[in-house]
C-alpha cells in the first residue's frame, strides 16, 4: 500500500509532460490575486518643512489578478534532468475586489527625487538635480494615480535630465509583457528529492547582490517543494521580488477544504539583525542606515534595483526594529494580517494555499543641495505600499486532490 502510493507520488510529481505536477506547474490552476494597500501621506508639507513624522493612512485593497499566464520557453534538458522556463508577468485589475479604481489619487514620496538624490551623492550633481527639480516643479512628495504608481509614469524632473536616463518611473515598471527568469529547475526524474529546486536563475547559481551565503539561490520558487515534507524541515525558497532566498518553518496543522496541510511561516528570525541571528550578517550591506547592523526587519535591495534605495520589509514594519517605524505614524503591524505563510500538502509537496506579504519602502535622506530635501533632519525609510499575494486551491481541484491523493492514503 504505502510503497505503491510513494511510487505513484514520485511518478506524478516529476516535472515532465503527462504528470499531474507538470500540468499545474506550467499554468497554475489556482487563481492568484495580488492586493495592494497604498500608504497615503497625510502631512507632506510638515514633513518637508519641519522633518515631522510622516503620517500615513493605508488605502486598499486594490486587487489584480496575477500569475494567470503559462510558463514560456519550457525546455527539458535530459542530460542534467532540469527544465528551464520563463515566468511571464501580467496583471489585470479587478474592480469588484477593490475599494476604488486605478485612477484613484495618492500622495506618496517622489520616487525620482528620492532615488536620484541617493544615486548621485556628489554635491555638484545634486545642485544640477536641484535646478531640474525646481524647474519641473517637483517636490519631496507627489500626487499619483494607482496606475501611475504601480505601472509607471513619465517623470517631469527626469525628463529634463540632459543625458540619457530612463524617464519612466513606477514601482513595478516594467511589468506587463515582461518575464521573470530564465529559471532552470530540477525536474526530479533522477532524484525526486530535488524536484522543483532551482539549479540556476538567469544562468547563474548566485545572485551577485550579496556577500557569502546570502547570495545563494536556495530551494524552489515556493510553488511546490519536493514530496514527503516533514514538519521538522526548514523549507528554503527563492523570491525574485525580494532579491534573495529565504526560508519557512512549520507552524501548525491546517485543514484546507478537507485536505490536511502543513502551515509553514516565515519566522521573525529571518528578518532579525546579525546581532540576534548571525547568519544574517551578509544581508547588512551598509552601516549608517542599519545603525551598525543593529536595525532589523528591513532589507536594502538597492543593489538589485540599479542603485535605487528600495527597502523591503513586512507590511507595517512587522518584525522590524522600533527605530525603523519611529518616524512613521499610522502603522499597526499584526502577525495574522501581515506575515507570510505557505500551506503545503506534505505528501506531494504542493503549495495549496499561500499568502505572500511584503512592503515596498524607499529611503529618503536629507540633502544640503536639494532644496526640497534640505530641511530634513533625519533619514526616513518611507512605506509606499504593501501587498498581499494569495492563492487557494479551487473546490474542484481540492475534490480531485482529496480523491486521488489524501483519500487514497487515509
Amino acid at each position: 500500500g504505502d510503497l505503491l502510493i510513494q511510487k505513484t507520488i514520485k511518478k506524478q510529481v516529476v516535472l515532465e509532460e503527462g504528470t499531474i505536477a507538470f500540468k499545474n506547474w506550467v499554468k497554475t490552476g489556482t487563481e492568484v490575486y495580488r492586493q495592494f494597500w497604498i500608504f497615503d501621506v497625510q502631512n507632506p508639507q510638515e514633513v518637508m518643512m519641519n522633518s515631522s513624522n510622516i503620517q500615513v493612512k493605508q488605502r486598499g485593497p486594490y486587487t489584480y489578478r496575477v500569475r494567470f499566464l503559462a510558463k514560456e520557453n519550457v525546455t527539458q534538458d535530459a542530460e542534467d534532468n532540469t527544465v528551464s522556463f520563463l515566468q511571464p508577468n501580467g496583471a489585470i485589475f479587478e474592480p469588484s475586489l477593490s475599494v476604488g479604481t486605478e485612477a484613484d489619487n495618492f500622495t506618496v514620496l517622489n520616487l525620482a527625487v528620492a532615488a536620484a538624490s541617493h544615486i548621485y551623492q556628489n554635491q555638484f550633481v545634486q545642485m544640477i538635480l536641484n535646478s531640474l527639480i525646481n524647474k519641473s516643479k517637483s517636490s519631496m512628495f507627489q500626487v499619483r494615480t494607482l496606475r501611475e504608481l504601480l505601472w509607471g509614469y513619465r517623470d517631469p524632473f527626469l525628463s529634463l535630465v540632459p543625458y540619457p536616463v530612463t524617464t519612466t518611473v513606477g514601482l513595478f515598471y516594467p511589468y506587463n509583457n515582461t518575464a521573470d527568469g530564465v529559471y532552470k529547475v530540477f525536474n526530479g526524474k533522477d532524484n525526486i528529492s530535488k524536484v522543483a529546486i532551482i539549479d540556476t536563475y538567469k544562468g547563474k547559481r548566485n545572485l551577485s547582490y550579496w556577500e557569502s551565503h546570502c547570495d545563494m539561490i536556495n530551494g524552489t520558487d515556493a510553488a511546490s517543494f519536493p514530496p514527503f515534507v516533514e514538519k521538522s524541515q526548514v523549507l528554503q525558497f527563492f523570491s525574485s521580488d525580494i532579491c534573495r532566498s529565504i526560508y519557512a518553518v512549520f507552524e501548525s496543522d491546517v485543514n484546507l477544504k478537507g485536505i490536511p496541510v502543513y502551515r509553514f511561516v516565515l519566522p521573525s528570525k529571518a528578518f532579525a539583525s546579525p546581532v540576534e541571528n548571525p547568519d544574517n550578517y551578509c544581508f547588512c550591506t551598509e552601516k549608517i542606515i542599519s545603525k551598525n547592523c543593529t536595525s532589523y526587519g528591513v532589507l536594502d535591495i538597492s543593489k538589485c534595483k540599479e542603485g535605487r534605495p528600495v527597502y523591503i520589509s513586512l507590511p507595517h514594519f512587522l518584525y522590524a526594529s522600533p527605530d525603523v517605524s519611529e518616524p512613521i505614524d499610522g502603522l499597526n503591524p499584526n502577525e495574522e494580517e501581515h506575515r507570510t505563510y505557505l500551506d503545503i500538502e506534505p505528501i506531494t509537496g504542493f503549495t495549496l494555499q499561500f499568502a505572500k506579504r511584503l512592503q515596498v519602502n524607499l529611503l529618503v535622506k536629507p540633502s544640503e543641495k536639494i532644496q526640497v530635501l534640505k530641511n530634513l533632519k533625519r533619514n526616513y525609510i518611507v512605506p509606499i505600499l504593501w501587498l498581499n499575494e494569495t492563492g487557494t486551491i479551487g473546490d474542484e481541484k481540492a475534490n480531485m486532490f482529496r480523491s486521488q491523493v489524501t483519500g487514497k492514503i487515509n
Partner: antibody
Framework: QVQMKESGAELVRPGASVKLSCKAL????????IQWVKQTPVHGLEWIGG????????VYNQKFKGKATLTADKSSSTAYMELSSLTSEDSAVYYC?????????????WGQGSLVTVSA | ETTVTQSPASLSMAIGEKVTIRCITS??????MNWYQQKPGEPPKLLIS???TLRPGVPSRFSSSGYGTDFVFTIENMLSEDVADYYC?????????FGSGTKLEIK
Amino acid sequence: QVQMKESGAELVRPGASVKLSCKALGYTFTDYEIQWVKQTPVHGLEWIGGIHPGSSGIVYNQKFKGKATLTADKSSSTAYMELSSLTSEDSAVYYCTRGGGYDGAWFAYWGQGSLVTVSA
Amino acid sequence: ETTVTQSPASLSMAIGEKVTIRCITSTDIDDDMNWYQQKPGEPPKLLISEGNTLRPGVPSRFSSSGYGTDFVFTIENMLSEDVADYYCLQSDNLPFTFGSGTKLEIK
C-alpha cells in the same frame, strides 16, 4: 597628491577657437566634478561651468552658454574646455578646479591657469 | 542667480591688526559661503569652506561667520604674508557666484 595640470598659454586670432585641457592626477577622476573659472582684471573671478565625468552631468553658467563647451575623457582623466568665436573679451586666465565632491570643499584644488590672449 | 556683494574693494591694514571683509548675498544661502586667498601669479587658494569650516593646514588666525545673507571673513592678527586678494564664493545654488574681491595691502 591631488593635482590639476593645465595646458599652456595660447595666442589666438579673433573668430577662432581654442581647446584647453586639464589633466587630473591623484584621485579617481569620475568621483569629482571639474569646474572652469575665468579671471580678468575687470570682472574678477567668474564661474563658467562644470562637468561631472562619473554621471556625465554638465552645467554652464548662462553667460557662457554657446561660448564654452565642456567635455571629459575618462580614459586619460582629462577635462577639456573649448572656447569658440573668440573676441578680445575672451582674453583671460582660465582655471580648471576640482569641485566640492562630497564635503562642500568647493574649488579646493586649482590648476596653474591657462592664459588665453585673443589678438589679431 | 544669487549676486554676491563684497566690500571693501581694497583695504590697507597694519601688521597685527584685525582685518574684516564682508559679503552680502541677494538670496538666503544658509552657510554655503567659501573664502579664497589669491597671491599674484598664483591660482586662488581655498581657506574656508561651507559651514565656516577652516581647511586643513590653514592658520587659525583666519575665520569666518555668518548665515543666510550676511557673511564676514576675519584675519585676527594680520601678517605680511597675508597680503593678497580675497574672494568669497556662494555655493548654495547654480550658477556659483564670486564676490568682486578685496585687495589687502600693508599700511
